[in-house]
């Protein structure tokens, strides 16, 4: 059994999250994950999910009664999602920590926008994707 | 030339982001993107970058002088990053909009944690990753 399972059960007790009523009004993450089978699509979604949990754990980092559970779960997330790669985890955390209201950050983000956009689609590297039209209406 | 280029130049003027001093103290996104060549790693990082830009654009949605530029860039992001797939974009936005301080959201997130963790690594599907030992002693 993976290390996180016992600790996640401990968190369920702490958050009173074991009751069946918790599942009312649908899921947060599971339904969305079910929609996406392709690895790159899953990573787009899981990236947001992992950053949510990291933020949640940060909010409870001073709570001694669940500290060990939180640390163990974070550790196992690092193993599973970042493949224990500290550089990957650090780059990810840098991105999640940028403040969208900081004027210098805003200027840098706009300064880099054209290059970021140029790299967004796999087509930027492989040239495989055919773009017939630019018609997004959403 | 992609539609976003002209509009991004317009945003550069608006944010005063064309000056060379903007590049001082390194990049926000470009240096990180340079580190990651594998598609799934890139998606992990780009997911955070795109959500940053969406938040940034949301903060300026009422500014008439850049509204057209922002809309055009968002539209092109949807084409490039979400492959014009509205369901993908909608699922992504749901994830970015969950409030980490909402008690019901917290309970749901903890309720789903074990299943989310089980799906985090590609190994969950492919069985490729070798885990030498699982030696958990609580």
């Amino acid at each position: 059994q993976d290390p996180y399972v016992k600790e996640a059960e401990n968190l369920k007790k702490y958050f009173n999250a074991g009751h069946s009523d918790v599942a009312d009004n649908g899921t947060l993450f599971l339904g969305i994950l079910k929609n996406w089978k392709e690895e790159s699509d899953r990573k787009i979604m899981q990236s947001q999910i992992v950053s949510f949990y990291f933020k949640l754990f940060k909010n409870f980092k001073d709570d001694q009664s669940i500290q060990k559970s939180v640390e163990t779960i974070k550790e196992d997330m690092n193993v599973k999602f970042f493949n224990s790669n500290k550089k990957k985890r650090d780059d990810f955390e840098k991105l999640t920590n940028y403040s969208v209201t900081d004027l210098n950050v805003q200027r840098k983000a706009i300064h880099e926008l054209i290059q970021v956009m140029a790299e967004l689609s796999p087509a930027a590297k492989t040239g495989k994707r055919k773009r017939s039209q630019m018609l997004f209406r959403g | 030339q992609d539609p976003y280029v002209k509009e991004a130049e317009n945003l550069k003027k608006y944010f005063n982001a064309g000056h060379s001093d903007v590049a001082d103290n390194g990049t926000l996104f470009l240096g990180i993107l340079k580190n990651w060549k594998e598609e799934s790693d890139r998606k992990i990082m780009q997911s955070q970058i795109v959500s940053f830009y969406f938040k940034l654009f949301k903060n300026f949605k009422d500014d008439q002088s850049i509204q057209k530029s922002v809309e055009t860039i968002k539209e092109d992001m949807n084409v490039k990053f979400f492959n014009s797939n509205k369901k993908k974009r909608d699922d992504f936005e749901k994830l970015t909009n969950y409030s980490v301080t909402d008690l019901n959201v917290q309970r749901k997130a903890i309720h789903e944690l074990i299943q989310v963790m089980a799906e985090l690594s590609p190994a969950a599907k492919t069985g490729k990753r070798k885990r030498s030992q699982m030696l958990f002693r609580g």
């Epitope: 640390e71 990957k88 | 580190n35 958990f136």
Partner: antibody, heavy 120, light 112 residues
Framework: EVQLLESGGGLVQPGGSLKLSCAAS????????MSWVRQAPGKGLEWVST????????YYADSVEGRFSISRDNSKNTLYLQMNSLRAEDTAVYYC?????????????WGQGTLVTVSS | NFMLTQPHSLSESPGKTVTISCTGS????????VQWYQQRPGSAPTTVIH?????PSGVPDRFSGSIDGSSNSASLTISGLQPEDEADYYC???????????FGGGTKLTVL
Amino acid sequence: EVQLLESGGGLVQPGGSLKLSCAASGFTFSSNAMSWVRQAPGKGLEWVSTLTGSGGTAYYADSVEGRFSISRDNSKNTLYLQMNSLRAEDTAVYYCAKGTELVGGGLDNWGQGTLVTVSS
Amino acid sequence: NFMLTQPHSLSESPGKTVTISCTGSGGSIATNYVQWYQQRPGSAPTTVIHEDNQRPSGVPDRFSGSIDGSSNSASLTISGLQPEDEADYYCQSYDSDNHHVVFGGGTKLTVL
């Protein structure tokens, strides 16, 4: 100040067993991955094994897989390496090293090492 | 498997600058941090560079680290060489695919 003190080395016959210990102090032991690295006489550094901070997941070099077992007791701030079926090529100084909170970070502090000699 | 290759030995005069290379094969060197360790004869290794280019406190700024993605290599540069810099230097990284810590073979630096 971080301190790592290895013990348990010595002379052992081929096929025999030995258990190394590493007593740690000066940092939050349970928050850091810990590793064993060895160095045969006159040779370079060779990674042996790493264990996550909780003790939940262990990784081994191919050369010791199935023969060596890494473990830790976080209440005693101690890391262990159980070595079985020892071979002459396992002869080396064994270093205990403190990692970062992720297995894939560096090894930022090292003990002075304990010598293991496998010989008949 | 990911491997790191270093020159077996290098020598340089005091006061000069030396660069020790560490070339990756079987994967990209830029996707995991690179560390550099100094080992003087009869002593345990100590870290001189961690996380590609960061110097631990107490390590002089004569030591610097860099990564070059295009040549898939890392470098340790020591300027203003001093006699006490004579030692073995090892680069180290991580193979995420099989969770192995990887060391280079080591470079014996002689200060003439």
